[in-house]
């Protein structure tokens, strides 16, 4: 028998520095977690103690904090090189700055293989990107070899900006021939490393003959055996064992997100490469693990540029951006409109001639807007200003909901109207009319939504049984502010870009902004 230790991360999303327990900005250092300096300490400790160790990342290193906004992926390559990652799979967010934003800072600079078997380049890009990412890589580990085959969510064209010269194939269809190729090369220990979410990870384990272990990402799935060490609630045991169609036991793992945990999986293979045992758990990277001093010093050096960036002008406003709770928790506010417009703009993807865009709607809890921006400061808007408006370090995510769920959400928006509560929704691509004289749960009298399958966008009545795509804060997708119906009834959820980054990119693109209150939210006569 031969033992392999797999250390793994996924969905780190730019958390190079240590964070608070909820993965937002670190405030009290003695209670902070994660970060690459602490990760390196633990990785080195395990490398010293155990003979056959692989350090793998399952994608979405890109996007999530000011580190990515400023360094655009150079920070990912630099610090992953420093930690000596053995391989990485491409995630959807690796394409957020287009293919060039992946090639130059990361693919050309990484000293480790970057993998995806189901992304195929065509046209002029094919020769430009050739060899910069691979379908698989065979890695020597001790006296053995291990094959790593990569995969990426086929939804990436809807979630990011991969352009028109990359084709995202079905994961299982694309993986099988690559695994077969590894088998013909006499590689009998194969890890599928990828970024398509836990459900697809399990399907890969079940369907792809020859895959021994699946290391996944995208769904931020927390698996744990025993009593979990922090706030995350396990979605299942670690590892999650899937019985494949050909009768093998395939461990499937994921390590939550944001670098809070280091996945730790020990696998025992027999002489034919069959997995015969597996055990482990994610390791919570809390303050009991010291930050490595040399990596920490490097982080501090790179940090300087971030502090300078946050006070630079992104663009200008020529109107007052009303982000006050007195407005945003009671009525349509122009800060809410600005944010929703930015959210839709960030999700423009012309992937189908029948649709002007795949999504037209945005909802945003008024309580998530924490500050106004005064235009009387020469109109200047900085990252620092936006951080005051959106201080929670959330993401703007894409969900699919039935019309009936949206109707419930809008009823919830005003079920206790007038108490300055955060659930009052700001909107984009939606016209809503409330009648507050009616009883809670029956106050939405009109709900029209902007069409997507149209050449000239117009507002049509919401259909209860239709499935709609909506952009919203991750806070709402997770049922925050009482929106349990969203969490319980959503049909799909893909995490998106950092909230501040979305708005800052929009403002930089527009240069001058002047959002208005324009009748997106109305109250029928006699009730308000």
């Amino acid at each position: 028998a031969w033992e392999l230790t797999i250390l793994h991360t996924n969905d780190v999303h730019s958390r190079l520095e240590q964070t608070s327990e909820d993965s937002s900005k670190c405030v009290n250092a003695s209670r902070c977690m994660g970060g690459v300096a602490r990760l390196f300490t633990k990785v080195q400790q395990i490398r010293r103690a155990e003979p056959n160790v692989l350090l793998l990342d399952a994608g979405d290193q890109y996007q999530g904090t000011i580190w990515f906004t400023v360094y655009k992926g150079a920070e990912v390559a630099h610090f992953m090189n420093a930690l000596r990652y053995d391989a990485m799979a491409l995630g959807n967010h690796e394409f957020d700055n287009g293919v060039e934003g992946l090639i130059e800072p990361l693919l050309k600079e990484a000293k480790f293989p970057i993998l995806s078997a189901n992304i195929k380049a065509k046209g002029p890009l094919a020769s430009q990107i050739s060899g910069l990412y691979l379908p698989y890589k065979v890695l020597p580990v001790g006296d053995e070899v291990v094959g790593i085959v990569g995969y990426t969510s086929k939804e990436t064209p809807f979630l990011s900006n991969p352009g028109t010269n990359l084709v995202f194939e079905d994961e299982i269809t694309a993986l099988q021939p690559e695994v077969d190729k590894l088998k013909t090369l006499n590689v009998n220990k194969i890890i599928a490393l990828g970024h398509s979410g836990f459900e697809m990870d399990k399907l890969i384990a079940q369907k792809v003959r020859g895959v021994d272990v699946v290391v996944g990402g995208h769904s931020n799935t927390f698996l744990y055996t025993g009593n979990p060490p922090s706030k995350e609630v396990p979605a299942g045991k670690y590892p999650f064992i899937v019985t494949s169609d050909d009768g093998r036991k395939v461990p499937v793992v994921q390590a939550y997100a944001f670098g809070k945990y280091l996945g730790y999986l020990k696998i025992e293979f027999d002489e034919r490469g069959n997995v015969i045992s597996s055990h482990g758990n994610p390791i919570l990277l809390n303050s009991s693990i010291p930050e490595d001093p040399s990596i920490k010093a490097d982080i501090n050096k790179w940090r300087i540029k971030l502090d300078n960036y946050s006070t630079q002008e992104l663009g200008k406003t020529i109107v007052y951006l009303d982000g006050s709770s007195q407005s945003c928790r009671f009525r349509e506010c122009n800060m809410g409109n600005l944010i929703c417009d930015a959210m839709i703009n960030n999700n423009l993807r012309h992937t189908d001639e029948m649709f002007w865009n795949h999504v037209s709607m945005c909802i945003l809890n008024g309580g998530g807007i924490r500050s106004p921006i005064d235009e009387r400061n020469n109109g200047t808007i900085t990252w620092e200003n936006l951080a005051a408006v959106l201080p929670f370090g959330g993401t703007f995510d894409l969900v699919q909901l039935k019309g009936s769920t949206l109707k419930k959400a809008f009823e919830h928006s005003v079920h206790r109207y007038g108490q300055s509560t955060g659930e009052f929704l700001q909107v984009g691509g939606i016209h809503v009319v409330y009648d507050l004289s009616r009883k809670p749960g029956d106050r939405v009298v009109k709900l029209d939504v902007l069409c997507t399958k149209c050449r000239v966008p117009s507002y049509d009545p919401l259909k209860m049984d239709e499935v709609y795509k909506v952009i919203l804060p991750n806070f709402l997708a997770n049922g925050g502010d009482g929106f349990q119906m969203i969490k319980d009834e959503l049909l799909r959820h893909d995490s998106g870009d950092q909230d501040i980054n979305v708005v800052s990119t929009y403002i930089s693109k527009m240069k001058v902004i002047y959002p208005a209150v324009e009748g997106r939210i109305k109250f029928s006569t006699g009730s308000h």
């Epitope: 064992i241 009768g247 025992e268």
Partner: antibody, heavy 119, light 107 residues
Framework: EVQLVESGGGLVQPGGSLRLSCAAS????????MHWVRQAPGKGLVWVSR????????GYADSVKGRFTISRDNAKNTLYLQMNSLRAEDTAVYYC????????????WGQGTLVTVSS | AIQLTQSPSSLSASVGDRVTITCRAS??????LAWYQQKPGKAPKLLIY???SLESGVPSRFSGSGSGTDFTLTISSLQPEDFATYYC?????????FGQGTKVEIK
């Protein structure tokens, strides 16, 4: 109801051979990994051998390697243990055990069959 | 091979007592540990898997805890049918190994 019934035990002389069987019922035998575990009189449990669901991979404790052979017939829902070159120290109750499909532990055991190696 | 050391090797207790049995592994095994109960002349019966998960149908007075190298089986209130021998077993690697057993006898 899951049932595992061992048979084939008995008295055998040192150097002799014996073939144990374990008849499985109440579950899809061909989907499960199976094991043999033994227990010498008055002693603790000792793992002996393992076979995966399709029979393509097997494993043995060092003490029986080269002498014992585990096999299965999925069409007959039966697990076997062929024991050759038996020694006095192989005297024990032999249990077959089913490994849980989504884990690595034994969730069901048979009642055991006694093997006595003595001259 | 990973060695498992159970303690005590035997204990005497009365009905209603709280009983604790420990199992120490010679190296870290995460939560890859099971506990079995065996009565004389009978097959072992699974009580606890993954160190702390209760097998269905097993009374809730049985509980398991621990991870890494140190594990505990607890019977919160001993019942007459609980007098038996208890074994821990690791399933983190081959060969699968068992503790030497703890015999729980009537005081």
């Amino acid at each position: 109801e899951v049932q595992l019934v061992e048979s084939g035990g008995g008295l055998v002389q040192p150097g002799g051979s014996l073939r144990l069987s374990c008849a499985a019922s109440g579950f899809t035998f061909s989907s499960y990994w199976m094991h043999w575990v033994r227990q010498a009189p008055g002693k603790g449990l000792v793992w002996v051998s393992r076979i995966i669901s399709d029979g393509s991979s097997t494993g043995y404790a060092d003490s029986v390697k080269g002498r014992f052979t585990i096999s299965r017939d999925n069409a007959k829902n039966t697990l076997y243990l062929q024991m050759n070159s038996l020694r006095a120290e192989d005297t024990a109750v032999y249990y077959c055990a089913r490994e849980f499909s989504s884990g690595w532990y034994f969730d069901y055991w048979g009642q055991g069959t006694l093997v006595t190696v003595s001259s | 091979a990973i060695q498992l050391t159970q303690s005590p090797s035997s204990l005497s207790a009365s009905v209603g007592d709280r009983v604790t049995i420990t199992c120490r592994a010679s190296q870290g095994i995460s939560s890859a540990l099971a506990w079995y109960q065996q009565k004389p002349g009978k097959a072992p019966k699974l009580l606890i898997y993954d160190a702390s998960s209760l097998e269905s149908g097993v009374p809730s007075r049985f509980s398991g805890s621990g991870s890494g190298t140190d594990f505990t089986l607890t019977i919160s209130s001993l019942q007459p049918e609980d007098f038996a021998t208890y074994y821990c077993q690791q399933f983190s690697s081959y060969p699968r190994t068992f503790g030497q057993g703890t015999k729980v006898e009537i005081k």
